[in-house]
Interface confidence: medium
């Protein structure tokens, strides 16, 4: 047999095995050894078998969708039945004070490898024996502790096969400059040792994305807004857009990043190299926001030029191929330019990745503050209790819920949440009256908020002993203003 | 050897328009940005623009944003920079220089254009 | 944006000295270049990547520095080097330069 008759149905072209060449990896035209790596159908009895206690199930992962060009990880990690698991040294064994369908077992090992490798290698002195191969015939990689390896992997895609031998977890990376754009299907075949041969016991398979776009993602963040997941953010207050771009392999970390953004609100085009930016928009309404990313990255060369024809074609929207000239001059040393280039590429190649958005500007709470506070007199009954009058003013909208957070003077511990609607006129002006239980130092967190908006002040208050000569004192004045301004109070006591 | 030679001198009148080009030669002109920068007499540069003359990707200066517009003509090497409702204050030398390989930061304008002066008087 | 305070705006200094030139910007930065312009001609590029000497510049021109503090030194001042000198980053938009430091030879 051959790998493809074993590792999978789908026979990609002769032009795709051609030029999806991956390096370190063998052509599924080799042979399969048989004997030594048995081949079970789907459905054949033989897989209830395969694994001591149940069925070992296989996770298949990648960092998909991958750059072209750059490194595409795959993740596999074998599930063992309950209780089951791998120990340092590599064998399965039982979980201690676990309990299975089957009970409690009395023998440690689920499989004791190591004990099998000391009785039954039959090895000469080099360590290598017929039995420690591949299914191509290729020999282990006999490097510290590969004893301990007991799984072999087969990874199968675009008609090449990898073999791994691993534990109970591997990771193999591909280099997508030669991979095919779109979906493609990657399987793997998991096998155990048994003996002087070996078991499958596992097969997975998933499909990973290479594309020629940079794979974009945007964070928008505002103070005071409500829900930052349902794209509607407030007039007049900076939304954060942060761009987060899709790159595992780290693919472009010598590149220039250029970020152009378009906000939808006739403010123009802004262009960045910043991943982050601000922009407050001063109108309601629904825009639509873009974003192209645009970054240099290592890629092919394109052909030499044939002989020049009157007119040029027009580069492709998508890529934009750039050749580095080594004779071109430059302004220092032999080759200065070499400088920004990534090491070992000649040429360099346009990416691009789009992001869009459609972004709701309402009216909203932009600001709270405390501009009073009152200590309001207590009947005799509660002389442990002070009533306190916070006068609140807010900017922007109206707000319909008011509430308190009284906490420690670290504001981390919570005493006491009440929060209850409120009626304000137009002025935004309103009292709230909360009660202390006690003297000392208190945080209280006030919020504004309505439908789609949330405004915070904070301040520390000083609540003294019930004696009537002692007035209410602030302890300390802050809020979250980005203006970092110290809140003016004014304080009355009756 | 690298060479950037610019149009000459232009003399016009408040609320026209100029266009200066920038022809280049000696290196593979789709391979660098070109910058635009412009200097008033005894004063110091300021950044206009750049333009990826690859995919005429711009990046302008929000000082010069709505005035301005670059332009690239790959066929002949040459990158042309537009400047609209002219003011007194635009009265200056304009200069190209050839920017970092592929837009590095690593690398400022190795190259500069002799410059083209423009006068605005009414 | 990032805004580049060169100092001193001018100076003179007599053929041997050594002189030296700071460039502070306003945020941390990568990388700095240093242009001598004379007058009635284009800027010059002499030091590129805050410390790399461009093609064909004299080794008595060096630059060091880095985050937001950089400095551009001639070890040996010669007749030829009377200009002005700015520096230049372009690691944020807008790409921005130094007032520009006159020197003058005594």
């Known amino acids: 047999k051959r790998f493809h008759d074993v590792l999978g149905n789908e026979r990609p072209s002769a032009y795709m095995r051609e030029h999806n060449q991956l390096n370190g990896w063998s052509s599924d035209e080799n042979d399969w050894n048989e004997k030594l790596y048995p081949v079970w159908k789907r459905g054949d009895m033989r897989w209830k078998n395969s694994w001591k206690g149940g069925r070992v199930q296989a996770v298949l992962t990648s960092d998909s969708p991958a750059l072209v060009g750059s490194n595409i990880t795959f993740a596999v990690n074998l599930i063992f039945p309950r209780c089951q698991k791998e120990d340092a040294n590599g064998n399965i064994v039982y979980e201690k004070n676990c309990r299975n369908e089957a009970g409690l077992s009395a023998d440690p090992y689920v499989y004791n490898w190591t004990a099998w490798s000391e009785d039954s290698d039959g090895e000469n002195g080099t360590g290598q024996s017929h039995h420690n191969v591949f299914p191509d015939g290729k020999p282990f990689p006999h490097h510290p502790g590969w004893r301990r390896w007991n799984f072999i992997y087969v990874f199968h895609t675009l008609g090449q096969y990898f073999q791994k031998l691993g534990r109970c977890s591997v990771r193999v990376s591909v280099n997508t400059a030669n991979v095919t754009l779109g979906p493609q299907l990657m399987e793997v075949t998991v096998y155990r040792r048994h003996g002087r041969a070996y078991v499958p016991i596992a097969q997975v398979k998933d499909v990973y994305v290479v594309t020629d776009q940079i794979p974009v993602f945007v964070t928008m963040f505002q103070k005071n807004d409500r829900n930052s997941s349902d794209e509607t953010f407030l007039k007049d207050l900076p939304i954060m857009f942060d761009v987060l771009i899709h790159d595992p392999s780290h693919f472009l970390n010598y590149s220039t990043i250029n970020y152009k953004w378009s906000f939808g609100d006739n403010t123009g085009l802004f262009v960045s190299t910043n991943h982050t930016v601000n922009h407050t928009y001063v109108l309601n309404g629904t825009f639509s926001l873009n974003l192209t990313v645009k970054a240099a990255a290592p890629g092919p060369c394109p052909p030499p030029p044939p002989p020049p024809r009157p007119s040029k074609p027009t580069p492709s929207l998508a890529t934009t191929l750039k050749s580095y000239d080594s004779n071109t001059p430059g302004p220092a040393g032999d080759n200065p330019l070499e400088l920004s280039r990534i090491p070992d590429e000649n040429c360099q190649i346009n990416r691009y990745g789009h992001f869009q958005a459609t972004i709701t500007i309402v009216e909203g709470i932009l600001e709270v503050n405390i501009i009073q506070m009152t200590d309001v007199l207590m009947p005799v009954p509660w002389p442990e209790s002070s009533l306190i009058d916070f006068v609140v003013t807010c900017q922007g909208s109206i707000p319909t819920e008011v509430c308190t957070i009284i906490s420690d003077p670290t504001c981390e511990i919570t005493q006491n949440t009440v929060c209850s609607p409120v009626d304000v006129d137009e002025m935004c002006l309103l009292t709230v009256r909360r009660t202390f239980n006690g003297s000392g130092t208190y945080c209280v967190n006030l919020t504004l908020g309505d439908d789609t908006s949330l405004a915070l002040t904070s301040t520390l208050i000083s609540v003294p002993d019930r004696d009537p000569a002692s007035p209410l004192r602030m302890a300390n004045e802050f809020d979250y203003k980005d203006d970092d301004d110290k809140l003016e109070h004014h304080h009355h006591h009756h | 050897q690298v060479q950037l030679v610019q149009s000459g001198a232009e003399v016009k009148k408040p609320g026209a328009s100029v266009k200066v080009s920038c022809k280049a030669s000696?290196?593979?002109?789709?391979?660098?940005?070109m910058g635009w920068v412009k200097q008033r007499p005894g004063q110091g540069l300021e950044w206009i623009g750049a333009?990826?003359?690859?995919?005429?990707?711009?990046n302008y200066n929000q000082n010069f944003a709505g005035r301005v517009t670059m332009t690239v003509d790959t066929s002949i090497s040459t990158a042309y920079m537009e400047l609209s409702r002219l003011r007194s204050d635009d009265s200056a030398v304009y200069f190209c220089?050839?920017?970092?390989?592929?837009?590095?930061?690593?690398?400022?304008?190795?190259?500069w254009g002799q410059g083209t002066l423009v006068t605005v008087s009414s | 944006e990032i805004v580049l305070t060169q100092s001193p705006s001018s100076l003179s200094a007599s053929v041997g000295d050594r002189v030296t030139i700071t460039c502070s910007a306003s945020?941390?930065?990568?990388?700095m270049h240093w242009y001598q312009q004379k007058s009635g001609t284009a800027p010059k590029l002499l030091i590129y990547?805050?410390?790399n000497l461009a093609s064909g510049v004299p080794s008595r021109f060096s630059g060091s520095g880095s985050g937001t503090d950089f400095t551009f030194t001639i070890s040996s001042l010669q007749p030829e080097d009377a200009a002005t000198y700015y520096c230049?980053?372009?690691?944020?938009?807008?790409?921005?330069f130094g007032g520009g430091t006159k020197l003058e030879i005594k």
């Open positions: 220089t050839r920017s970092g390989y592929y837009g590095s930061p690593k690398l400022g304008g190795d190259y």
């Open positions: 000696g290196y593979t002109f789709t391979d660098n940005w």
């Open positions: 333009i990826d003359p690859s995919d005429s990707f711009t």
């Open positions: 945020s941390s930065i990568s990388y």
């Open positions: 990547s805050t410390s």
């Open positions: 230049h980053q372009w690691n944020s938009y807008p790409c921005t």
